[in-house]
Every structure is written in C-alpha cells, then in structure tokens.
Interface confidence: low
C-alpha cells in the first residue's frame, strides 16, 4: 500500500525542506538547566526504536515508519559506546554506573569504579563513584526514580547504590560473609545512602521482613517479605520525613501526587518487577506514564529544580524472553511517558535525555512490504521452504527444532503477544548486544549531545548543564538553583 503522494518527488523535497528549515533555526541555549530528566529504555537499541515506531504507527492505523515517536522529536542525537571496562557487551549495572555516575565499571557492579571486582565485597570501600542524582540533591534539587522494574534493579540502583553484585536486592541475597564485611543490600542503600524524594516502581518484597505478607498477594508466600534482618525499610523511610507517604496501588498514587502535604513519596506496586504493560491491571497498578506524571507533580514544586530518572525497564525483559511483542509494547509505553513529561515540563529550563543502556541481538529485516504488520512474515520463503518473521533474534529461547528442523510459522502465530521470535542459537535467555545506542536530547545544553561518545559522557553533560559537581563553575546563565 503505497501512499499516492509519496510517488511524487515534491512530497519528499517539501518534507526535507521543512526539516532543513527547522534545523537551521536550532539555537544552542547558553542557559543552565534547572531540571534534569533522563529517560532510560533498558535494552532499547536502535532496532527496537525503529520497530516500536512502526508498531506505534500501525496501532494508529498508519503504515508505520513515517510515524514519529516522542523521542524522535528531540533535536539533538548522539551515539553512545556501551562497553564496560571488562566486557565488550555490558550489563545494566556497569552501564548505569557510566550514564549516571560518569565512570565506567565492571560487569554486574553498580556505582563503583572498575577497581572494584564483581562479588568481592572487600573491593567496595574507596571505589564508590557518586551519581548525578546524588550531586543534584546536594545542590538543593528534589530527586526521583521511576521504573517499571523493581526499584532495587540495576539501572535505578545506579542512581543511589554502590555494590559489587547487582543481584543483592535484599539482605537475603547477600552472602553472610559479605554482610559481615559490611556490604549492604541495595534495598537498604535505597533508604539510607541519600534522601530520594520520589521512588516509584516495583520491589515491595525486598523492603519487608521474611513472613510479611504482600498486600496484593497475601496468600502467596513467595511474594511476601524477604528480609532476614527483621527490618521494615518502608517504615524506616517513612520515619525519616514528616511528609512521607507510602502507597502500593494506583488509586493511592494518584491521591498522593495531588496532596500538598506529601513531600516524599514511595510507591511500590508489585513485589518484584511491575507487570508488562499488556498484563497490567489498570485498576491496581499505574502505568509508566502515570508514575512519571505523579513524580513530576511532586518534584516540580521545588523552586531549585529537580533530577528525575525514568526507566522503561522491561523492554529488556521482553527481549530476553525473545518476545518482541512485549519488548515493543513496553517501548511504546516508555515513549508515552516521554511525551507526557514533555507536556508537563518546559524545554526552556529542563534538559531531557533519552537513551538506552545497551542493545539486544534483535533484528528487523527480510524486505517486508510497507504497511505489513511489524510482527508479520517476510515475503516468500526461506531456503528450508518455510516462512520466517521480519523480527528475529541472533540468539535466545526462540530457537526450536522440530524433528531436526526449524518449525514453520504462520501470520496468526507470529502476531500473538506470547510468540517467541526464532533465533540462530539456542539460549535460555537472549543476550544483550554490543553496538552503539542512540542518545536523544532536548533543552538547555542539549546541543552538547553530538557525535559518537563514551556512555559516561551522558552523566557529564547532565552535571555540566545543571552546574553540578564537578562543573559548579559552569559559567552558564542563569546559574542553576537561583530561581528561588
């Protein structure tokens, strides 16, 4: 289905001329950013962005690729090199350290330089690196973390934690020897390392003592508290702040976000990670867009500004399962959150960045016809005389042999939300990929986001834009934090 107007060269020339006109008008702002927002699409490589763009368009009965994602509208783009100090292909812990702290670390460590060694507690002390969020708090800004994973997960933990093992969610996950050496679990660090004004996501079970039932699944012991130290970390956090509120469902979140007496808000909506958007109970759990809006309502009260981390964390999980439907619908919700944040903030005083921590071995190919379903089949057959999908994975659990051969696939099968796209190599979980990822930028100092950069550059751009350490002598006008 080719749109008739696209057959005419005038269509393309006019469209390009408009884009060129807009580009010529771009003026780098010489002002500081009062507010910083980093949107992190976990595992959102460029192939994921492209496929999600097409899906977003097709959901609106368009052909697909001509659609704009909210992130596509950001005027400045760079590429980010995602490798960790010890691995070509990184994990979400080492990458979080890079884009949130400005220093590269080792695989599966968080908030530590590469002098720290994975799982070796005694290499922690002295190797801590400080996040931009922590620096923003020191400068008097309000700070928040929003994610669709558990709030103790690798990416959000990069904003507040220092750990040699990203899997140490609660003290039950930390070996006794490491506990004795003084290594703290991530949940404990969430409430004790720094004062975070807004914490929204999953991860209830890591905050409560073993045997504490979960409010949503009280009869499921596996969803209850996991802590061995008997601590109720939510209670401890509430006791720290006069205006603190804890919520665990959507209704309470929406109420709390509009309550002027609430100064600190923790919302934990699932025992572990939040549900995929396609499985979310919209009466109980908020969407990423709703959590982002709630966070912005609270944080934007501070006249000195804010720092906000927003993660679409389950894009990555969908890809690990080789379920592109899940990964792409998560990406669309992530983009919806970016769009809503854009409506609630001004690019005059808010630097917004969108990036990924790493990519996935997810491909989109096979010469499909324009307008054909993103989850559909490529035209024609493969050499084994069977159909194949346009979305595929290099490795992962989608590898299946039936009687020594690759199974055939129909359009109705491949369109199912549960369908696992096929892969070349059988693995229990599909892996990350090592190619560069995009960084989109809008707002004060966004023009600095250009070229091919180390992933660490992202943290430095944010710090410089808001005149945070080590760039307090940033010489930008008006200086950050003078609007009160």
């Amino acid at each position: 289905i080719i749109p008739v107007e696209e057959e005419n060269p005038d269509f393309w020339n006019r469209q390009a001329a408009e884009a060129l006109g807009a580009a010529k008008k771009l003026q780098p702002a010489q002002t500081a950013a009062k507010n910083l927002i980093i949107f992190l699409g976990d595992g959102m490589g460029v192939s994921t962005v492209t496929a999600a763009r097409i899906l977003k368009g097709q959901k609106k009965d368009k052909l697909g690729p001509e659609t704009f994602l909210a992130m596509d509208r950001f005027p400045y783009v760079a590429l980010s090199k995602t490798y960790s100090v010890d691995k070509h292909v990184p994990d979400s812990g080492a990458t979080a350290t890079a884009y949130l702290c400005g220093v590269k670390g080792n695989f599966q460590t968080i908030g530590l330089s590469a002098a720290a060694r994975f799982n070796q507690c005694n290499t922690t002390r002295g190797n801590e690196v400080i996040s931009v969020m922590n620096r923003a708090k020191k400068a008097g800004k309000s700070v928040g973390v929003v994610t669709t994973t558990r709030v103790q997960h690798a990416s959000p933990a990069g904003a507040y934690a220092h750990t040699v093992n990203r899997n140490w969610y609660s003290d039950a996950d930390v070996p006794a020897s490491a506990r004795q050496e003084g290594c703290q679990d991530i949940a404990t660090q969430l409430i004790s390392n720094m004062d975070i004004d807004v914490i929204l996501g999953g991860g209830r079970k890591y905050m409560f003592p073993m045997g504490t039932p979960d409010p949503e699944y009280p009869d499921d012991y596996s969803q209850g508290g996991t802590r061995l130290d008997g601590k109720n970390l939510v209670q401890e956090w509430l006791a720290k702040h006069q205006g603190a509120r804890y919520v665990w469902n959507r209704t309470e979140l929406l109420q709390a976000s509009l309550d002027p007496s609430v100064t600190h808000l923790m919302g934990l909506f699932e025992p572990g990670d939040m549900k995929y958007e396609i499985h979310r109970d919209s009466t109980l759990d908020p969407s990423l867009m709703e959590m982002t809006e709630a966070a912005l309502l609270l944080l934007s009260r501070n006249p000195r500004g804010f720092f906000l981390f927003v993660e679409g964390g389950r894009i990555d999980h969908g890809h690990h399962e080789s379920r592109a439907y899940r990964a792409l619908t998560e990406t669309i919700m992530f983009d919806d959150a970016i769009e809503r944040a854009g409506q609630l903030t001004s690019e005059e005083d808010t630097l917004s960045l969108v990036t990924a921590d790493h990519s996935h071995v997810f491909s989109f190919g096979g010469y499909p016809l324009r307008g054909s379903s993103i989850f559909g089949l490529a035209p024609g057959k493969a050499r084994d005389r069977k159909a194949y999908t346009v979305l595929l994975y290099g490795n992962g659990p989608g590898y299946v042999l039936k009687d020594g051969a690759r199974p055939d696939v129909t359009e109705s099968e491949s369109g199912s939300p549960e369908y696992r796209q096929q892969s070349a190599v059988p693995l229990d979980g599909e892996t990350h990929a090592g190619e560069d990822v995009a960084v989109f930028a809008r707002g004060p100092q966004a023009h600095l986001v250009h070229g091919v950069q180390e992933q660490t550059f992202i943290a430095h751009v944010m710090a410089f834009a808001a005149c945070l350490e080590p760039y307090t002598a940033c010489d930008l006008a008006p200086r950050a934090g003078t609007t009160d």
Partner: nanobody, 126 residues
Framework: QVQLVESGGGLVQAGASLTLSCAAS????????IVWFRQAPGKEREAVSC????????YYGDSVQGRFSSSTDNAKNTVSLQMNSLKPEDTAVYTC???????????????????WGEGTMVTVSS
C-alpha cells in the same frame, strides 16, 4: 495527611463494657485492614483484633475471643472495638493500626503495619 485517631478510652469497673473508636483520614479502609493492638504496662504489645472490609472478615486474639467485637462505619471511615465483660487484665493502651495486607493476613505482626494511631488508655478496676 494520613492519620489514625483513637477515642473512647477511660476507667471502668470489671464486667462493664466500653467502645473504642478509630477514625481514619487520608486513606480509605477499602485497601487496608485495621488492627487493634494493646500494650499493658511492662508487657509485650499484643494484637487484639483485625477487621478487613475487603475480605468481610474479623479476627480476634485468644484472650478476647467472644468478648470483643470489631465493626466498621464506612460512611465515617471509622472502626469500632466493642469490649464487653472487661477484666482487670484488659488494662492497657489500645492503639489502632492500618496493615499493608488488605485481608488481615499476618495481622498480628507489628512489622506489617503501615500507619499507627497515638493510642487511648483503658483501665479496668476490680
């Protein structure tokens, strides 16, 4: 702001009755269970009763079973604890609390409570 405020405490004779009230503001009972605790001087805190609007159920501690009953007034967002046949050993500070669990699961564990009231004193003389 979330608040739980108890009222109705006082001095009564053994065998008498007393009704305590717990008024909640800032949240509704729909997503919580309300638990009454008591603490006698020099003794451990003890869970007395739990009422869950969601589950439509009430639970009582062994020492008060058959003598105490809990009820809710949804319109006023209050929970009452009707205490009959009071004994001197019922003398304590009675505190209401809101649990994380909406259906009273694990209701006797203090760590499961999200919000607490200040408490009201009940003295039963012989």
């Amino acid at each position: 702001q979330v608040q739980l405020v108890e009222s109705g405490g006082g001095l009564v004779q053994a065998g008498a009755s007393l009704t305590l009230s717990c008024a909640a503001s800032g949240f509704t009972f729909n997503t919580r269970s309300i638990v009454w605790f008591r603490q006698a001087p020099g003794k451990e805190r003890e869970a007395v009763s739990c009422i869950s609007k969601v589950a439509g159920s009430t639970y009582y501690g062994d020492s008060v079973q058959g003598r105490f009953s809990s009820s809710t007034d949804n319109a006023k967002n209050t929970v009452s604890l009707q205490m009959n046949s009071l004994k001197p050993e019922d003398t304590a500070v009675y505190t209401c609390a809101a649990s994380f669990a909406p259906n009273c699961y694990g209701w006797s564990v203090a760590a499961n409570m999200e919000y607490w009231g200040e408490g009201t004193m009940v003295t039963v003389s012989s």
